[in-house]
């Protein structure tokens, strides 16, 4: 069966297309091509007589068509109006006719697109920006790229106008990026130059660095202020509410206690019309801002209850500090047997009782800092009971009476390892 194949099917304007004939019959007189889906003399493009090898142009000939001896038709410099159907009429030697129809589509070679914007300086969380891909082209598909990636999914991004317009609602600083649009049709794809979206924002709440609060007299005070802002913020400093200077850095050499106070950094963005402040307290003092870790020394760590006394001493090299004591997370002293002396450096317990056994630590502090010692364990023992009063059962010691201690302990089971050890020592 006679068929027509268009190569290519989708043709770019200005290019060429070949209407290729398949299964051409034998013993032909000639053939003619027509524009459209039927044979119409007024729409004849070109004819060809095989015997004379002569081509004859028809009424629809444009000067761009060339017929091959095998009946295929080449059309050059394609124009939009060439889109559609083409019919080949074959006249056989027996004058029996045969027809076949083919078609192709014409698309423009796309120009390089460009992006127009309705707002070149949008403000964060306030403005929307609409990008439009120009020019508007029939039968073109529009795509958008952000930093050379396809569009992220976001409720703030909206495509409209056949994807030709990209709208960003309530822009954020994160929308500051490179935007490109791309136009595509079956014969070409073109990408625009980048448009950089410059979102104006800030200033954010300023940060004052360094974070130190305490300074010694004679030191240099150097403070720096930074607030994220586009365009960059303008900075000013106030001390105790009084304007000092319009700089990002504040430097005061050789400070004294009189420089203590509240230091305010003011950041302003004249384009967004926003400003923010941060207040930092500076304290100039002789006191050490870092108190060293104290150490506890004990006259002994294992004592005999109701007999011995013990002295715990909190050692520190810092001056101008205070000391406090803790036992089992409770502040001391907690009984009349406990006494503090030498400005709380020494804790004395006299006499030591069973309930005094446990963990002790001290804390040294001044108005601006504190530090605590490692804990120390105080062990409290009682004198060993006579041999005849103890029965050893499963490594546990039980009282057997005759000593009057039964009244006190009610014959309860006690893990009294120190007494047991003492007993074995005398064996």
């Amino acid at each position: 069966k006679l068929t027509i194949e268009s190569t290519p099917f989708n043709v770019a304007e200005g290019k060429e297309v070949l209407l290729l004939v398949h299964n051409l019959p034998q013993h032909l007189f000639g053939y003619s091509w027509y524009k459209g889906e039927r044979v119409d003399g007024n729409r004849q493009i070109i004819g060809y007589v095989i015997g004379t090898q002569q081509a004859t142009p028809g009424p629809a000939y444009s000067g761009r068509e060339i017929i091959y001896p095998n009946a295929s038709l080449l059309i050059q410099n394609i124009i939009q109006n060439d889109t559609g159907f083409y019919t080949l009429h074959v006249i056989k030697s027996d004058l029996v006719n045969e027809e076949a129809t083919g078609q192709f589509r014409v698309y423009p070679e796309l120009p390089k697109p460009s992006i127009s914007s309705n707002n070149s300086k949008p403000v964060e969380d306030k403005d929307a920006v609409a990008f439009t891909c120009e020019p508007e082209t029939q039968d073109a598909t529009y795509l958008w790229w952000v930093n050379n990636q396809s569009l992220p999914v976001s409720p703030r991004l909206q495509l409209s106008n056949g994807n030709r317009t990209l709208t960003l609602f309530n822009v954020t600083r994160n929308d500051s990026a490179s935007y490109k649009c791309e136009t595509q049709n079956p014969v070409s794809a073109r990408r625009s130059d980048s448009v950089i979206l410059n979102v104006l924002y800030g200033p954010d709440t300023p940060t004052i660095s360094p974070s130190d609060t305490y300074y010694r007299p004679g030191a240099n005070l150097s403070l720096s202020c930074y607030a994220a802002s586009n365009p960059p913020a303008q900075y000013s400093w106030l001390i105790n509410g009084t304007f000092q200077q319009s700089t990002q850095e504040l430097f005061i050499p050789n400070i004294t206690v009189n420089n203590s106070g509240s230091y305010t950094c003011h950041a302003n963005n004249s384009v967004t019309g926003c400003n923010r402040t941060t207040v930092k307290t500076i304290i100039v003092t002789e006191l050490s801002p870092v108190v060293a870790k104290p150490q506890i020394k004990a006259s002994k760590t294992t004592v005999t209850g109701d007999k011995d006394s013990v002295n715990l001493t909190c050692s520190t090299n810092d001056t101008g500090i205070s000391i406090r004591w803790f036992f089992k997370n409770q502040s001391l002293p907690s009984s009349e047997r406990m006494k503090l002396s030498q400005g709380n450096i020494t804790l004395s317990i006299n006499p030591v009782k069973r309930e005094d056994a446990g963990t002790y630590w001290c804390e040294v502090f001044n108005p601006i800092s504190k530090n605590q010692s490692d804990p120390i364990m105080l062990n409290v023992n009682y004198n060993a009971l006579p041999q005849e009063n103890l029965i050893n059962v499963d490594e546990q010691l039980y009282f057997q009476g005759g000593s009057g201690l039964n009244d006190i302990f009610e014959a309860q089971k006690i893990e009294w390892h120190e007494a047991r050890a003492h007993h074995h020592h005398h064996h």
């Epitope: 081509a55 000939y61 000067g63 050059q76 410099n77």
Partner: nanobody, 119 residues
Framework: EVQLVESGGGLVQPGGSLRLSCAAS????????IGWVRRAPGKEEELVAG????????RYADSVKGRFTISADTSKNTAYLQMNSLRAEDTAVYYC????????????WGQGTTVTVSS
């Protein structure tokens, strides 16, 4: 009506020059590729030159390169073939043709103009 009418042929001595003209009607030569084909007895038909006004490109057969120049005047809808340093083997009937920019295919239907190179 679509027509291609050739003129400018004649008798010329070897080494001489001729200028052929092709007047087109019924279509614009600026939209297509136009050229010259020659037929000589006992020789194969040869496409000697072509010009595509819409791309600005020209093409020549190796046998005429450097001697023949094709041009077009779109305001007159006419194509020309300037033939210099003519040789006896250039003797042929020259036809104005619609040619392909990229393929060796063409159509012509004019009467042609005869060029004879002889001393």
């Amino acid at each position: 009506e679509v027509q291609l009418v050739e003129s400018g042929g004649g008798l010329v001595q070897p080494g001489g020059s001729l200028r052929l003209s092709c007047a087109a009607s019924g279509f614009n030569i600026k939209d297509t590729c136009i050229g010259w084909v020659r037929r000589a007895p006992g020789k194969e038909e040869e496409l000697v030159a072509g010009i595509c006004e819409y791309t600005g490109s020209t093409r020549y057969a190796d046998s005429v390169k450097g001697r023949f120049t094709i041009s077009a005047d779109t305001s007159k809808n006419t194509a020309y073939l300037q033939m210099n340093s003519l040789r006896a083997e250039d003797t042929a009937v020259y036809y104005c043709a619609i040619v392909s920019q990229s393929r060796s295919v063409y159509n012509y239907w004019g009467q042609g103009t005869t060029v004879t190179v002889s001393s």
